[in-house]
């Protein structure tokens, strides 16, 4: 028997520095977690103690904090190289700055293979990107070899900016021939490493013949055996065992997100490459694990540029950006409109001639808008200003909801109107009319939504049984501010970009902004 230790991360999302327990900015260092310096300490400890160790990342290193905004992926390559990652799979967010924003900072600089079997380049890009990412890689580990085959969510064109010269194929269809190829090369231990979410990870384990282990990402799935060490609630045991169609027991793992845990899986193979046993658990990277001093020093050196960036002008406003709770929790506010417009703009993807865009709607809890921005400061808007408006370090995510769920969400928005509560929704691509004289739960009298399958966008009444795409804060997608119906009834949820980054990019693009209050939210009284 031969034992392999797989260390794995996924969805780190730019958390190079240690964070608080909820993966936001570290405030009290004695209670902070994660970060590459602490991760390195643990990885090195395991490398010293165990013979056959692989360190793998299942994608979405890009996007999530000011580190990515400023360094644009150079920080990912630098610190992953420093940690000596053995392989990485491409995630959807690796394409956030287009293909060039992947090639130059990461693909050309990484000293480890970057993988995806289901992304095929065409046209002029094919030769430019050739060899910079691979469908699979055979890695020597001790006296043996291990094949790593990569995959990426085929929804990436809807979630990021891969351009028109990359084709995202069905994961299972694309993986099978690559695994077969590895078999012909006498590689009998194969790990599928990828970024398509836990449901697809399980399907790959079930359907792709020859895959021994699946290491996944995208869905931020936390798996654990026994009593979990922090706040995350396990979606199942670690590893999650799937019985494949050909009768094998295939371990599937994922390690939550944000570098909070290091996935730790021990696999025992027989001489023919069959998995005999698998066990392990994610390791919580809490303050009991010291940060490596040399990596920490490097982080501090890179940090200097971030502090300078946060006071630079991103763009100008020529109007007062009303982010006051007196406005945003009671009526349409222009800060809410600005943020929603930025959220939609960040999700412009012309992937189908029938649609001007795949999504037209945004909702945003008024309580998430924490500050106004005064235009009488020469109109200057900085990252620092935006951090006061959006201080929670969330993301703006893409969900699919039924019309009936949206209607219920808008009822919740005003169910206790007048108490300055945070659930009052700001909107984009939506016209809503409330009648507060009606009973709570029955106050939405008109709800019109901007069409997507149209060449000239116009507002049409919501249909209860239709499925709609909506951009919203991850806080709402997770049921925050009492929006349990969104969490319970959503049909799909994909994590998006860092909230401040979305708004800052929009302001930089527009250069001068002047958002208005324009009748997106109205109040009426009378018969309907």
């Amino acid at each position: 028997a031969w034992e392999l230790t797989i260390l794995h991360t996924n969805d780190v999302h730019s958390r190079l520095e240690q964070t608080s327990e909820d993966s936001s900015k570290c405030v009290n260092a004695s209670r902070c977690m994660g970060g590459v310096a602490r991760l390195f300490t643990k990885v090195q400890q395991i490398r010293r103690a165990e013979p056959n160790v692989l360190l793998l990342d299942a994608g979405d290193q890009y996007q999530g904090t000011i580190w990515f905004t400023v360094y644009k992926g150079a920080e990912v390559a630098h610190f992953m190289n420093a940690l000596r990652y053995d392989a990485m799979a491409l995630g959807n967010h690796e394409f956030d700055n287009g293909v060039e924003g992947l090639i130059e900072p990461l693909l050309k600089e990484a000293k480890f293979p970057i993988l995806s079997a289901n992304i095929k380049a065409k046209g002029p890009l094919a030769s430019q990107i050739s060899g910079l990412y691979l469908p699979y890689k055979v890695l020597p580990v001790g006296d043996e070899v291990v094949g790593i085959v990569g995959y990426t969510s085929k929804e990436t064109p809807f979630l990021s900016n891969p351009g028109t010269n990359l084709v995202f194929e069905d994961e299972i269809t694309a993986l099978q021939p690559e695994v077969d190829k590895l078999k012909t090369l006498n590689v009998n231990k194969i790990i599928a490493l990828g970024h398509s979410g836990f449901e697809m990870d399980k399907l790959i384990a079930q359907k792709v013949r020859g895959v021994d282990v699946v290491v996944g990402g995208h869905s931020n799935t936390f798996l654990y055996t026994g009593n979990p060490p922090s706040k995350e609630v396990p979606a199942g045991k670690y590893p999650f065992i799937v019985t494949s169609d050909d009768g094998r027991k295939v371990p599937v793992v994922q390690a939550y997100a944000f570098g909070k845990y290091l996935g730790y899986l021990k696999i025992e193979f027989d001489e023919r490459g069959n998995v005999i046993s698998s066990h392990g658990n994610p390791i919580l990277l809490n303050s009991s694990i010291p940060e490596d001093p040399s990596i920490k020093a490097d982080i501090n050196k890179w940090r200097i540029k971030l502090d300078n960036y946060s006071t630079q002008e991103l763009g100008k406003t020529i109007v007062y950006l009303d982010g006051s709770s007196q406005s945003c929790r009671f009526r349409e506010c222009n800060m809410g409109n600005l943020i929603c417009d930025a959220m939609i703009n960040n999700n412009l993807r012309h992937t189908d001639e029938m649609f001007w865009n795949h999504v037209s709607m945004c909702i945003l809890n008024g309580g998430g808008i924490r500050s106004p921005i005064d235009e009488r400061n020469n109109g200057t808007i900085t990252w620092e200003n935006l951090a006061a408006v959006l201080p929670f370090g969330g993301t703006f995510d893409l969900v699919q909801l039924k019309g009936s769920t949206l209607k219920k969400a808008f009822e919740h928005s005003v169910h206790r109107y007048g108490q300055s509560t945070g659930e009052f929704l700001q909107v984009g691509g939506i016209h809503v009319v409330y009648d507060l004289s009606r009973k709570p739960g029955d106050r939405v009298v008109k709800l019109d939504v901007l069409c997507t399958k149209c060449r000239v966008p116009s507002y049409d009444p919501l249909k209860m049984d239709e499925v709609y795409k909506v951009i919203l804060p991850n806080f709402l997608a997770n049921g925050g501010d009492g929006f349990q119906m969104i969490k319970d009834e959503l049909l799909r949820h994909d994590s998006g970009d860092q909230d401040i980054n979305v708004v800052s990019t929009y302001i930089s693009k527009m250069k001068v902004i002047y958002p208005a209050v324009e009748g997106r939210i109205k109040f009426s009284t009378g018969s309907h």
Epitope: S404, G441, D465, E489
Partner: antibody
Framework: QVTLKESGPGILQPSQTLSLTCSFS??????????VSWIRQPSGKGLEWLAH???????RYNPSLKSRLTISKDTSSNQVFLKITSVDTADTATYYC????????????WGQGTLVTVSA | DIQMTQSPAALSASVGETVTITCRAS??????LAWYQQKQGKSPQLLVY???ILADGVPSRFSGSGSGTQYSLKINSLQPEDFGTFYC?????????FGGGTKMEIK
């Protein structure tokens, strides 16, 4: 006020096509958000939703009967039609049309119903 | 498709009594439920929507409740005009199916 009234052949033979008309007033299907459904009720039995048409000509059908149903509308004359092909005795029922706004899921206004008997 | 199962199929009760009719969905319908009353030879009339909101003109002795797959309609202090057949209907997704009905007679 809102009123709906169904009309049909009363009696027809198996294998024929049933044509029903719903004439309504008090609202218009040219108004965004309006819709009309057909629902039937065999004598002494429960209600079965058949089909729905939205203001924008979007249609919904009960999957168990979809191949036999066609719903349509004439906006200018305030009418909605339902055709059921290849009828047999199991299609004997009172047929109702009902109004349903797109923002609601319920039927707030119903017609009085028209009895259709399929008999050889 | 979601099936709606009503119980009881029939019941007899006296004026002044309190009765409860239940409706079970074969899947989670997330409170998207309406109740109707139908009198002999008449068309159904909306009583309750969104599980618990009374339609205009419906007396407050009627109340709806429930969540997930289990829902109920309660009538306090039955009045003579309350007798008839009651139907639940879900509108979580098309097809918008009805329950089999509960026939309520005067004892």
């Amino acid at each position: 006020q809102v009123t709906l009234k169904e009309s049909g052949p009363g009696i027809l033979q198996p294998s024929q096509t049933l044509s029903l008309t719903c004439s309504f007033s008090g609202f218009s299907l040219s108004t965004s958000g309006m819709g009309v459904s057909w629902i039937r009720q065999p004598s002494g039995k429960g209600l079965e939703w058949l089909a729905h048409i939205y203001w924008d000509d979007d249609k919904r059908y009960n999957p168990s009967l979809k191949s036999r149903l066609t719903i349509s509308k004439d906006t200018s004359s305030n009418q909605v039609f339902l055709k059921i092909t290849s009828v047999d005795t199991a299609d004997t029922a009172t047929y109702y049309c009902a109004r349903r706004r797109s923002l609601d899921g319920w039927f707030a206004y119903w017609g009085q119903g028209t009895l259709v008997t399929v008999s050889a | 498709d979601i099936q709606m199962t009503q119980s009881p199929a029939a019941l007899s009760a006296s004026v002044g009594e309190t009765v409860t009719i239940t409706c079970r969905a074969s899947g989670n319908i997330h409170n998207y439920l309406a109740w109707y009353q139908q009198k002999q030879g008449k068309s159904p009339q909306l009583l309750v929507y969104n599980t618990q909101i009374l339609a205009d003109g419906v007396p407050s002795r009627f109340s709806g409740s429930g969540s997930g797959t289990q829902y109920s309609l309660k009538i306090n202090s039955l009045q003579p005009e309350d007798f008839g057949t009651f139907y639940c209907q879900h509108f979580w997704d098309s097809p918008w199916t009805f329950g089999g009905g509960t026939k309520m007679e005067i004892k």
